[in-house]
Amino acid sequence: VPLSRTVRCTCISISNQPVNPRSLEKLEIIPASQFCPRVEIIATMKKKGEKRCLNPESKAIKNLLKAVSKERSKRSP
């Protein structure tokens, strides 16, 4: 990972566009920390393993998070 030694935050740009939950491999929520003073959301797509930073303040992204957590709770016993 190029920036592993120097980076404080992961995201350079953020997207307001929600991603299709079906095309999601993984959704990571990184809480604010001493290294990066903001919450970061990283979506890993099934296609080519592309990673995309999402805007935590976007209504569409908040809805996506709700949908994903609902899906997870359905699956877990």
């Epitope: 120097t6 953020i14 903001r38």
Partner: antibody
């Protein structure tokens, strides 16, 4: 439409300072990382500096480190490049460019929008 | 620091022909970090390809990117008159730096 417009270029003597500006319009500026890239006359492209969407992380090419400072004002939709201790080799067209949507340290979406550039000439 | 080399320096072709441009890195580069740009005289560069093989928005499908490791290729399947320009590859690497190759000029034969 999506647009970047650079300004502030001109002729300046070696050792002096200059501040470039890049006015953004047609998109949510505060969501995008921004770059400065330069091109000396008749030469190729040289990356200068990048700043993330919130202005937290800033990185520079070795050739300008300690002399140039990148900054942004999201309330004014404007990117800046403060250039100090200018040298003849800094003579170039300076472009501002937008980092692709959702770009991060794991996946580079390229520089997808560019301004038309502003010319900086360092000469005595 | 990774150095990018592009070949050939100049490619002389006719409209309708296929153009194959090479970008070689001095060390292995993740395909996630490789992009291609087109620049015409007096104009700003334009993003063509990111992630080594994904076309940017609005780029015609005659442009395609491929490759991995140290060898990457930009292919223009059938050259149109507006495709005669300089093409740059770019990689995003440690420190971080965003290095450009020296460019390949595609001109009319």
């Amino acid at each position: 439409q999506v647009q970047l417009v650079e300004s502030g270029g001109g002729v300046v003597q070696p050792g002096r300072s200059l501040r470039l500006s890049c006015a953004a319009s047609g998109f949510t500026f505060s969501n995008y990382g921004m770059h400065w890239v330069r091109q000396a006359p008749g030469k190729g492209l040289e990356w200068v500096a990048v700043i993330d969407f919130a202005g937290i992380n800033k990185y520079y090419a070795d050739s300008v480190k300690g002399r140039f400072t990148i900054s942004r004002d999201n309330s004014k939709n404007t990117l800046y490049l403060q250039m100090n201790s200018l040298r003849a080799e800094d003579t170039a067209v300076y472009y501002c460019a937008r980092e692709g949507e959702g770009s991060n340290i794991y996946f580079f979406y390229g520089m997808d929008v560019w301004g038309q550039g502003t010319t900086v000439t360092v000469s005595s | 620091e990774i150095v990018l080399t592009q070949s050939p320096g100049t490619l002389s072709l006719s409209p309708g022909e296929r153009a194959t441009l090479s970008c070689r890195a001095s060390q292995s580069v993740s395909s996630s970090y490789l992009a291609w740009y087109q620049q015409k005289p007096g104009q700003a560069p334009r993003l063509l390809i990111y992630g080594a093989s994904s076309r940017a928005t609005g780029i015609p499908d005659r442009f395609s990117g491929s490759g991995s490791g140290t060898d990457f290729t930009l292919t223009i399947s059938r050259l149109e008159p507006e495709d005669f320009a300089v093409y740059y590859c770019q990689q995003y690497g440690s420190s971080p730096i965003f290095t450009f190759g020296p460019g390949t000029k595609v001109d009319i034969k």
